[in-house]
């Protein structure tokens, strides 16, 4: 599979349009502060160079690796040191160290302005005036804000973005047509970014073995009729795809993802009965569809797991011969029988099984030692089941906003050192588990909830890693990938925390809150709630609820007042005084 010119190979495989889009995404994910025009210029130069290599693969520099070509191009940016500081030092390194250096400087929370959506007519005019630039700008803005966004999937989002404008800009009511589509793309995009961020964290922080274990469990749930060898092949290929994308090798990643989709569709009879519709779609839709496909039905009459993994006299022999293969088979067999379990639970069970075999296969009577291993699984299964039952009960009682508030209080008490914006963002996302998962029947709740929580807690971990402030967060984030959620769940009040000084400015509100969207208004109130808990971590839930109810009434009252600003100033002082008295601040 060696090619004289890697850049020519990828250009030919992907086509010019996808090649340019992927190079733009790669550059924007590396140099997140660079202006759009600078990136377009760099992409055009790379594309022109690639074309010369397609024409003659022996032309000068065409034999260089993509990292060398792209890194050299990024290092031509004149303002590298003043814009990026120490990232400029990467350019003094040789490949592969230079690329590793760029990867380490990716910023999960770049200091970029919030994307403000222009008026629909303004957007439609821009779309019609220069469709290509309009779509490139979309790729650029998403990629620089989400430096680990799954690049081939971003191409799919861009395709849907284009389709939305194509359809809606000629509709009678442009806004009614376009805005819901853009909202959906935004929400799906954030979710997609967060899911991919967990895959990259899994690979980069816990290694290929951890990612492969995750993939075995998930693919076995999804394709329970597939043989273990088939699942293993898919896991190997999927691991390569995600390793490439997480490593910034976006051209290879997109190319390999297309190959994997092709393979799956050519072999769907031995993989899953649910793939037919997906495989009739064009490439980008096909890959997306396969990634989201529902679990196939479990084969009938699957034998008990105990026979091969507990009762057999060959357990230790089989384990010793090929440990990871045997554990992989255990995980495959357990996962295909349990679409009702979360992937992280399945991985905890496999880890427990591995630990037991490590201990027991060295014992005098191994069989006697591991005979009860499945009994150890019961508490591991019941823990997430109970937690989900309780939190869904609470969600149904409170509704999403107040459920988020309960989580805000819970997490602020656990890790009060974490910045208020991070606590608000993470707790709001944790709270969305209610509307996302609690509607499901029991059999679908756990995979929905716990695997979603893994994604959200990873957001907390990557944001915290940038500026670590809490040893407890670091501990839960780094000790075990699959035990992150139980680790955070088990945290109690941080008794070492010294309450924050009271600052009236934090609780001063102005008339501008009245013009905010409902979501933004909620965020303002939730920000105040976190600050309140940071000032008074011993406040009871009922005290906090009373203060929040008073606060909501205050905002509602002043937003109806004739002189809003005066109302906010005068009533605000009264509210702060009353809250201080109620909480003993």
């Amino acid at each position: 599979d060696a090619h004289k010119s890697e850049v020519a190979h990828r250009f030919k495989d992907l086509g010019e349009e996808n090649f340019k889009a992927l190079v733009l995404i790669a550059f924007a994910q590396y140099l997140q502060q660079c202006p759009f025009e600078d990136h377009v210029k760099l992409v055009n130069e790379v594309t022109e160079f690639a074309k010369t290599c397609v024409a003659d693969e022996s032309a000068e520099n065409c034999d260089k690796s993509l990292h060398t070509l792209f890194g050299d191009k990024l290092c031509t940016v004149a303002t590298l040191r003043e814009t990026y500081g120490e990232m400029a030092d990467c350019c003094a390194k040789q490949e592969p160290e230079r690329n590793e250096c760029f990867l380490q400087h990716k910023d999960d929370n770049p200091n970029l302005p919030r994307l403000v959506r222009p008026e629909v007519d303004v957007m439609c005019t821009a779309f019609h005036d220069n469709e290509e630039t309009f779509l490139k700008k979309y790729l650029y803005e998403i990629a620089r804000r989400h430096p680990y966004f799954y690049a081939p999937e971003l191409l799919f989002f861009a395709k849907r973005y284009k389709a939305a404008f194509t359809e809606c800009c000629q509709a009678a009511d442009k806004a009614a047509c376009l805005l819901p589509k853009l909202d959906e793309l935004r929400d799906e995009g954030k979710a997609s970014s967060a899911k991919q961020r967990l895959k990259c964290a899994s690979l980069q922080k816990f290694g290929e073995r951890a990612f492969k274990a995750w993939a075995v469990a998930r693919l076995s749930q999804r394709f329970p009729k597939a043989e273990f060898a088939e699942v293993s092949k898919l896991v190997t290929d999927l691991t390569k795809v995600h390793t490439e994308c997480c490593h910034g090798d976006l051209l290879e990643c997109a190319d390999d993802r297309a190959d994997l989709a092709k393979y799956i569709c050519e072999n769907q009879d031995s993989i899953s009965s649910k793939l037919k519709e997906c495989c009739e779609k064009p490439l980008l839709e096909k890959s997306h569809c396969i990634a989201e496909v529902e679990n196939d039905e479990m084969p009938a009459d699957l034998p008990s797991l105990a026979a091969d993994f507990v009762e057999s006299k060959d357990v230790c022999k089989n384990y010793a011969e090929a440990k990871d293969v045997f554990l992989g088979m255990f995980l495959y067999e357990y996962a295909r029988r349990h679409p009702d379990y979360s992937v992280v639970l399945l991985l905890r069970l496999a880890k427990t099984y591995e630990t037991t075999l490590e201990k027991c296969c060295a014992a005098a009577d191994p069989h006697e030692c591991y005979a009860k291993v499945f009994d150890e699984f019961k508490p591991l299964v019941e823990e997430p089941q109970n937690l989900i039952k309780q939190n869904c009960e609470l969600f149904e009682q409170l509704g999403e906003y107040k459920f988020q508030n309960a989580l805000l209080v819970r997490y602020t008490k656990k890790v009060p050192q974490v910045s208020t914006p991070t606590l608000v963002e993470v707790s709001r996302n944790l709270g969305k588990v209610g509307s996302k998962c609690c509607k499901h029947p029991e059999a679908k709740r756990m995979p929905c909830a716990e695997d979603y929580l893994s994604v959200v807690l990873n957001q907390l971990c990557v944001l915290h890693e940038k500026t670590p402030v809490s040893d407890r967060v670091t501990k839960c984030c780094t000790e075990s990938l699959v035990n992150r959620r139980p680790c955070f769940s088990a945290l109690e009040v941080d008794e070492t925390y010294v309450p924050k000084e009271f600052n009236a400015e934090t609780f001063t509100f102005h008339a501008d809150i009245c013009t905010l969207s409902e979501k933004e208004r909620q965020i303002k109130k939730q920000t105040a709630l976190v600050e309140l808990v940071k000032h008074k971590p011993k406040a009871t839930k009922e005290q906090l609820k009373a203060v929040m109810d008073d606060f909501a009434a205050f905002v509602e009252k002043c937003c109806k007042a004739d002189d809003k600003e005066t109302c906010f100033a005068e009533e605000g002082k009264k509210l702060v005084a009353a809250s201080q008295a109620a909480l003993g601040l």
Partner: nanobody, 124 residues
Amino acid sequence: HVQLVESGGGLVQTGGSLRLACAASGRAFSTYAMGWFRQAPGKEREFVASINRSGSSTYYADSVKGRFTISRDNGKDTVYLQMNRLIPEDTAVYYCAADSEGVGFRNMLEYDYWGQGTQVTVSS
């Protein structure tokens, strides 16, 4: 405020039984989840059992499952912990706690109101 008073502790032999009670006053008892926690000498306080506001859901620590039973009588504003087949490791001060959210989580941080505790000693 909710006031909680535990009773029923004492000295018992291994294999014996005790029934703890926790009487609540001050607020609508039936809106609170109730929990039992315990603290052995030199150890951290730990979850034992909890019950939601209606009494329809109960939760137990693995170490007491099958031996202890939590129940409540909303008419009497009281929660109970029936402890059977006691073992020396159950020796601790047992605390009753109330959670206004009414669900019955395992974490101490969810419980705003606590009793003073009652001593349970299991001798071998």
